[in-house]
Each structure stands twice: as C-alpha cells, then as structure tokens.
C-alpha cells in the first residue's frame, strides 16, 4: 500500500478547516452586506 494512494487524515483535516474558514468569511461578509443594505 503506497502512501501516495491516500490523502492522509491530517491533510484532510487541514482542508476541512480551510473550507470552514472560507465559508465563515463568505457568510460573514454576506451577513454584513445584508445588515448594511437594510
């Protein structure tokens, strides 16, 4: 079983955290925009 076949669990964790961070930033931005437009 070659290491290259898999993305290891830490790499997957880091990607998940990056996605979470990105979504939080995008959603936060949208929320601020909505409040501003009211």
């Amino acid at each position: 079983h070659s290491d290259g076949i898999f993305t290891d669990s830490y790499s997957r964790y880091r990607k998940q955290m990056a996605v979470k961070k990105y979504l939080a930033a995008v959603l936060g931005k949208r929320y601020k925009q909505r409040v501003k437009n009211k």
Epitope: H1, S9, S11, Y13, R14
Partner: antibody, heavy 116, light 112 residues
Framework: SVEESGGRLVTPGTPLTLTCTAS????????MIWVRQAPGEGLEYIGF??????NTYYASWAKGRFTISKTSTTVDLKITSPTTEDTATYFC?????????????WGQGTLVTVSS | DIVMTQTPASVSGAVGGTVTIKCQAS??????LSWYQQKPGQPPKLLIY???TLASGVPSRFSGSGFGTEFTLTISGVQCDDAATYYC??????????????FGGGTEVVVK
C-alpha cells in the same frame, strides 16, 4: 526543541498548569499532543491542540479532567482537580507537522506528584 | 476511542536474532500508525511512521509493516542497544474517532 515545565508536588484537588515551550519553532504550524506516564507504566494519551486554529480534542477518559490551551509561544495543560492517580511524568510532543507522520519531537517530561 | 492492543507484553531476543512485535487497532486506521522506542528516564523516540517509513536517523534493522488493523514491528539483527520498551500509536485522526491518538500498552524487549 520543546520543553515541559510546571511539574511539582501538589495536594489533591489543587489545580496545576503545565507548560510546553517551543524554542526555534513556530508553534502555529503544528499539532501538539500531551501524553503522560505513571511510574513504571506505559504511555497514556491525553489530548491534542491544533496550534494553528486552537481546536482541542481529548481522550474520552481525559475530558473534563484536563484543559489544553495555547499562547503564541506555549501550549499549556491544566489538570483541573488532580487526584493521586494523576501522579506521572507529563510529556508534550510536536507533530510533523500534523499527526499522520507521528510525533518526532518530544520534551524530557515534567514530573507531577499528587499527594496529601 | 480507538483501542491499540500490543503483543507480547515482553519478548526476549538474542543478539543478532530477530524480534517481532504486533499491534492491533480496534478499527481500521489505514497505514497511519507509528512506532516508538523508549528507554528508562528518556522520552519516546519515533522509529517508524505511516506503518513502514523509517524516521530520520533510525537504523535499517528496524522495519514496520501492516495496514488497516494489523501491524508489525520487526528488529532484524538485534543489538544490545535495542533493549527498551516499544510502543505503537494510532495516527489516524477523523471527526468520527474524535481525533484521538492512543498508544498500545508497550512491549519490553530484553536482549540476551
């Protein structure tokens, strides 16, 4: 390198905070774990902190008994209410950079003795 | 939490001989397992990670194999300096297993 400090003799129920200090490395890039070893016993995993985002996770038995936190240069382990069973040498270790490649960098450990 | 079971608890090996230590995980951890050597009064030393990759500076007489739930550490051509306690550790972290990285109970290697 990493170095643990703060171990001493405490009476049961007295909170104690241990500190893991990193020299020459940026802690924010690594996963850090705390492990303990009672005299003559094996290694017991306590928990870890992702020093980048501050997320913490604990072994089931350790939840509520320990708190892991970080500053820019240290990772701390608080023993919330020590009992005599918490007498052990406490180690911190650094992932490389995460956990999947094992933990290559260990401190020498700090001894905690809980006794009345 | 994942449980790591190591066998035997103690093993004796002759200088130049071969010693084999087994580690079993309670669920699949793919190839994310490491092995450590610990001598009295010292912290653990990483020997092998990803089940079979030798850590930096570790002699080639140490080798690891396995995948899923069954793993083996082999010391070929045992030397006196190899007398120590050896531990396996789960390094497979997921939300489902709460990112917990337990150790096996340890195997003491006595060199004759």
């Amino acid at each position: 390198s990493v170095e643990e400090s703060g171990g001493r003799l405490v009476t049961p129920g007295t909170p104690l905070t241990l500190t893991c200090t990193a020299s020459g490395i940026d802690l924010s890039s690594y996963a850090m774990i705390w492990v303990r070893q009672a005299p003559g016993e094996g290694l017991e995993y306590i928990g870890f902190i992702d020093a980048g985002d501050g997320n913490t996770y604990y072994a089931s038995w350790a939840k509520g008994r320990f708190t892991i936190s970080k500053t820019s240069t240290t990772v701390d382990l608080k023993i919330t209410s020590p009992t005599t069973e918490d007498t052990a040498t406490y180690f911190c270790a650094r992932g490389d950079p995460g956990w999947s490649n094992g933990f290559a960098l260990w401190g020498q450990g700090t001894l905690v003795t809980v006794s009345s | 939490d994942i449980v790591m079971t190591q066998t035997p608890a103690s093993v004796s090996g002759a200088v130049g001989g071969t010693v084999t230590i087994k580690c079993q995980a309670s669920q699949s951890i793919r190839n994310e397992l490491s092995w450590y050597q610990q001598k009295p009064g010292q912290p653990p030393k990483l020997l092998i990670y990803k089940a079979s990759t030798l850590a930096s500076g570790v002699p080639s007489r140490f080798s690891g194999s396995g995948f899923g739930t069954e793993f083996t550490l082999t010391i070929s051509g045992v030397q006196c300096d190899d007398a120590a306690t050896y531990y396996c550790q789960n390094n497979y972290g997921t939300r489902r297993n709460n990112y917990v990285f337990p150790f096996g109970g340890g195997t003491e290697v006595v060199v004759k």
